[in-house]
């Protein structure tokens, strides 16, 4: 059980780091290419990991015009790193009924990042409540 809870803690730390990265990128939103990106919102239960991967795969790009280019590119790379998997996450990966990335509404970077943060907060909340109730399924 110890290694399982360590894995869960690692997962929580990673998710919180992702929120910090999203917040950091929000400060540089004017240095991002204002392209339309798939931005899942009101994600149905058990499709959180599928929506998360849509956010990670999106073509969020630096406009490469200012002094912030390096920090933005590093942050975007960090955002795309896979987080430690959980049992719930592994189970969700087998669901075929979740919407494809194409089907989500596309939004410019500001709204994209806001929706990404909202999903991350939801996933953290679910993770905490599942631990409180002694189960990883949510």
């Amino acid at each position: 059980h110890k290694s399982s809870s360590q894995g869960q803690d690692r997962h929580m730390i990673r998710m919180r780091q992702l929120i910090d990265i999203v917040d950091q990128l929000k400060n540089y939103v004017n240095d991002l290419v204002p392209e339309f990106l798939p931005a899942p919102e009101d994600v149905e239960t058990n499709c959180e990991w599928s929506a998360f991967s849509c956010f990670q795969k999106a073509q969020l790009k630096s406009a490469n015009t200012g002094n912030n280019e390096r920090i933005i590119n590093v942050s975007i790379k960090k955002l795309k790193r896979k987080p430690p998997s959980t049992n719930a996450g592994r189970r969700q990966k087998h669901r075929l009924t979740c919407p494809s990335c194409d089907s989500y509404e596309k939004k410019p970077p500001k709204e994209f990042l806001e929706r990404f943060k909202s999903l991350l907060q939801k996933m953290i909340h679910q993770h905490l409540s599942s631990r409180t109730h002694g189960s990883e399924d949510s």
């Epitope: 004017n30 204002p34 392209e35 339309f36 990106l37 795969k57 999106a58 406009a63 500001k110």
Partner: antibody
Framework: QVQLQQSGPELVKPGASMKISCKAS????????MNWVKQSHGKNLEWIGL????????AYSPKFKGKATLTVDKSSSTVYMELLSLTSEDSAVYHC???????????????WGQGTSVTVSS | DIQMNQSPSYLAASPGETITINCRAS??????IAWYQEKPGKTNKLLIY???TLQSGIPSRFSGSGSGTDFTLTISSLEPEDFAMYYC?????????FGAGTKLELK
């Protein structure tokens, strides 16, 4: 059908500024970003920048930052490019071109305007 | 900026022949290349995007291949209307950049 209608040719004096328009029709104007491309001596293509009509967000090539300003008028489905402090180097044909989307990705430019010829000469 | 080195700059061929145009990126652009056709008096036409996906309405004699840094546009069994200017463009990184173009002329 999708159409991008650009304003007519311009002859301007060095040091002046001017504005080119690109009127879009046949699609949801606020759902696609618009690019501007410079074509010098009938050949080389250079990306100037893009504008998102949904929120007016812009991105510019470093080479054209301070030279070009992109704006949008949603009510008339028109994007504008203002060229500042013109010199002979700015004599070229300027195209607007709509971003192409494929699923959740953006990939190239699928519809182009006919181009606006700009000649800078005293 | 990513440089797109396009070759050849000039190509003479006859109808029915197969030709290839190459584009080399100065660094990896994964699959993110588009190919365009330019003809006098017409608006530019998107032929291929994401390396090898044919734009709707474009004849299947046009094909694109490659990934990373080396890409090829192939036109098989040339038709008279294919004689035009062709450009590659990377859409992996901003600013977007184009190749210098290939003029395909009738031999």
């Amino acid at each position: 059908q999708v159409q991008l209608q650009q304003s007519g040719p311009e002859l301007v004096k060095p040091g002046a500024s001017m504005k080119i328009s690109c009127k879009a029709s046949g699609y949801d104007f606020t759902g696609y970003t618009m690019n501007w491309v410079k074509q010098s001596h009938g050949k080389n293509l250079e990306w100037i920048g893009l504008i998102n009509p949904y929120n007016g967000g812009t991105a510019y090539s470093p080479k054209f930052k301070g030279k070009a300003t992109l704006t949008v008028d949603k009510s008339s489905s028109t994007v504008y490019m203002e060229l500042l402090s013109l010199t002979s180097e700015d004599s070229a044909v300027y195209h607007c071109a709509r971003t192409h989307y494929y699923g959740s990705e953006y990939t190239g430019m699928d519809y182009w305007g006919q181009g606006t010829s700009v000649t800078v000469s005293s | 900026d990513i440089q797109m080195n396009q070759s050849p700059s000039y190509l003479a061929a006859s109808p029915g022949e197969t030709i290839t145009i190459n584009c080399r990126a100065s660094k990896s652009i994964e699959k993110y290349i588009a190919w365009y056709q330019e003809k006098p008096g017409k608006t530019n036409k998107l032929l291929i995007y994401a390396g090898g996906t044919l734009q709707s309405g474009i004849p299947s004699r046009f094909s694109g291949s490659g990934s990373g840094t080396d890409f090829t546009l192939t036109i098989s069994s040339l038709e008279p209307e294919d004689f035009a200017m062709y450009y590659c463009q990377q859409h992996e990184e901003y600013p977007l950049t184009f190749g210098a173009g290939t003029k395909l002329e009738l031999k």
